[in-house]
Amino acid sequence: ESALITQQDLAPQQRAAPQQKRSSPSEGLCPPGHHISEDGRDCISCKYGQDYSTHWNDLLFCLRCTRCDSGEVELSPCTTTRNTVCQCEEGTFREEDSPEMCRKCRTGCPRGMVKVGDCTPWSDIECVHKESGTKHSGEVPAVEETVTSSPGTPASPCSLSG
């Protein structure tokens, strides 16, 4: 959960410096890439690579840029108007229902099933029953029951998305 951070909490080099680009608020709000000064008179630019704001706002400070976790790759860097975009490394995925970490994709489908969808950064492999064509959403079977589709060991039990 987020913690409340004020200008006073920030290190001196992170605080709004006098030389930062300023403009005037419009209807009490500052444009993307800026935050409002404490007296409400100025819009102060965010610091490239350090913080950002994506919309018109009345924030007293810009939002901190996300740092990609280990196991993630940086798709695009943080700018003054857009946060860092991180993506799971190849062979791992992040489900919407459990987005806290990248999980290892399964290496194959259970016996009697065929793979119809590859591992992507946002989904595990997708398996369907050979006969019925229905999706599998159960747990990963034991290793000897797994039909391997790529090298490596099966991931820990998990549900398939989709």
Epitope: E1, S2, L4, H35, T54, H55, N57, D58, L59, L60, F61, L63, R64, E96, D97, P99, E100
Partner: nanobody, 126 residues
């Protein structure tokens, strides 16, 4: 279980005002950012405004800038959206939403939100 209940919608003339409320049943309301979205008939759900968990600072879509004001009462677990100078294009179902994960300071996209109310209809017409 997270429950969000919007109220305050209705029919209003152009230039009029409405105040929407969203009551939350979840105890983490006071530590979470919250957002308002809207969906007009035949269109995709779009971001309107979002407020920080501590209610110090908010985001606004450019289309509502200067006309709408978001606020949050953590003690009452209630989110508000004061809407003024309403226009025909503001006609939509308005939803309040809580994010699906707690590490984003101020989420502003539909996919970042996992808990949604049923919505309240706002109609602006002469």
């Amino acid at each position: 279980e997270v429950q969000l209940l919007e109220s305050g919608g209705g029919e209003v003339q152009p230039g009029g005002s409405l105040r929407l409320s969203c009551a939350a049943s979840v105890s983490t309301f006071g530590t979470s950012p919250v957002g308002w979205f809207r969906q007009a008939p035949g269109k995709e759900r779009e971001f309107v405004s979002a407020i920080r968990w501590d209610a110090v600072g908010a985001y606004y879509a450019e289309s509502v800038k200067g006309r709408f004001t978001i606020s949050k009462d953590n003690a009452k677990r209630t989110l508000y959206l004061q809407m003024s100078s309403l226009r025909a294009e503001d006609t939509a179902v308005y939803y309040c939403a809580l994010p699906r994960r707690g590490d984003s300071e101020l989420p502003s996209t539909v996919k970042e939100y996992g808990y949604w109310g049923q919505g309240t209809l706002v109609t602006v017409k002469p």
